[in-house]
């Protein structure tokens, strides 16, 4: 391990439509790749009426947009669907919305999602 | 093994439009980015775009924005690449590459634009 | 994002070596780490060899090697063999907030 980087070896693991996908809805999810390459965990929601709806949360992999963010924090201006990633074991059961362009206090707090 | 196979040749009329398929296997699809290459004959790589196959964010080059489409169907692994407005200077292999790195890449689809 | 610049061709005999330059600006090649290199030979899809400047991709030859300094980053080959024989281009990390270019590219002729 490189001093100062958080390895992630595994996410958590959440897939709103694990019946279609035939998949577990919620669990641990080992990340793999190629060995030199690193791996990040990553969620996506919406807001539907300033309501929180998981769609997916997981394994990514080697993205330079997730290099060294122990947080999972999306920053895009009202996405369809909002998407973080983040480095370290399961770095991904919390996530948040942080608008980049705001001045203002972020429209949401950070979420720790309860899947249904 | 990751493979990504994009769908036939084609042969269309200036001002049509063509939609390539990549169907992804091997690797989870919702794990990383699908981006889109073209290669005029004789010419090199041209980047035309990205999707997050997992939120289906896309980022488009200028030079394609209002005329590429990038989408996926993530029950099925597979993304797609629609290019409207067709012109003969269109023609070229279109190909699919994985993740930021493009570190796999599909065998290509030709697409021939004349009258 | 404008092209990267690349030499149109490079030749050298077996078992020397060759570099390939790419030449960006200080906002993409010169700041961050994120060049990579593919080969292509005739009627294939290209192939990456090597990610982030240096990084050389699972199953790649340790002949290939990759480097930067400020805004050009190098592909050096050594040793030559006849099957290097290729396209070579450059070109970006593309995702998320990054849009992807590409060099020109570089055809190598093993004389």
């Known amino acids: 391990a490189i001093l100062g980087r958080s390895e992630t070896q595994e996410c958590l693991f959440f897939n709103a439509n694990w019946e279609r996908d035939r998949t577990n809805q919620t669990g641990v999810e080992p990340c793999y790749g190629d060995k030199d390459k690193r791996r990040h965990c990553f969620a996506t929601w919406k807001n539907i009426s300033g309501s929180i709806e998981i769609v997916k949360q997981g394994c990514w992999l080697d993205d330079i947009n997730c290099y060294d963010r122990t947080d999972c924090i999306e920053k895009k201006d009202s996405p369809e669907v909002y998407f973080c990633c983040c480095e370290g074991n399961m770095c991904n059961e919390k996530f948040s919305y942080f608008p980049e362009m705001e001045v203002t206090q972020p429209t949401s707090n950070p979420v720790t999602p309860k899947p249904p | 093994q990751v493979q990504l196979v994009q769908s036939g040749a084609e042969v269309k009329k200036p001002g049509a439009s063509v939609k390539v398929s990549c169907k992804a296997s091997?690797?989870?699809?919702?794990?990383?980015?699908i981006n889109w290459v073209r290669q005029a004959p004789g010419q090199g790589l041209e980047w035309m775009g990205t999707?997050?196959?997992?939120?289906?964010?896309?980022s488009y080059a200028q030079k394609f924005q209002g005329r590429v489409t990038m989408t996926r169907d993530t029950s099925i692994s597979t993304a797609y690449m629609e290019l409207s407005r067709l012109r003969s200077d269109d023609t070229a292999v279109y190909y699919c590459?994985?993740?930021?790195?493009?570190?796999?890449w599909g065998q290509g689809t030709l697409v021939t634009v004349s009258s | 994002q404008s092209a990267l610049t690349q030499p149109a061709s490079v030749s050298g005999s077996p078992g020397q070596s060759i570099t390939i330059s790419c030449t960006g600006t200080?906002?993409?090649?010169?700041?961050?780490?994120?060049v990579n290199w593919y080969q292509q030979h005739p009627g294939k899809a290209p192939k990456l060899m090597i990610y982030?400047?240096?990084k050389r991709e699972s199953g790649v030859s340790n002949r290939f090697s990759g480097s930067k300094s400020g805004n050009t980053a190098s592909l050096t080959i050594s040793g030559l063999q006849a099957e290097d024989e290729a396209d070579y281009y450059c070109?970006?990390?593309?995702?998320?907030?990054?849009?992807?270019?590409f060099g020109g590219g570089t055809k190598l002729t093993v004389l």
């Open positions: 590459a994985r993740g930021g790195w493009f570190d796999y």
């Open positions: 091997g690797y989870t699809f919702t794990s990383s980015y």
């Open positions: 999707i997050n196959a997992v939120s289906g964010s896309t």
């Open positions: 200080s906002s993409d090649v010169g700041s961050r780490n994120y």
């Open positions: 982030g400047v240096s």
């Open positions: 070109g970006t990390f593309a995702g998320g907030d990054y849009y992807g270019v």
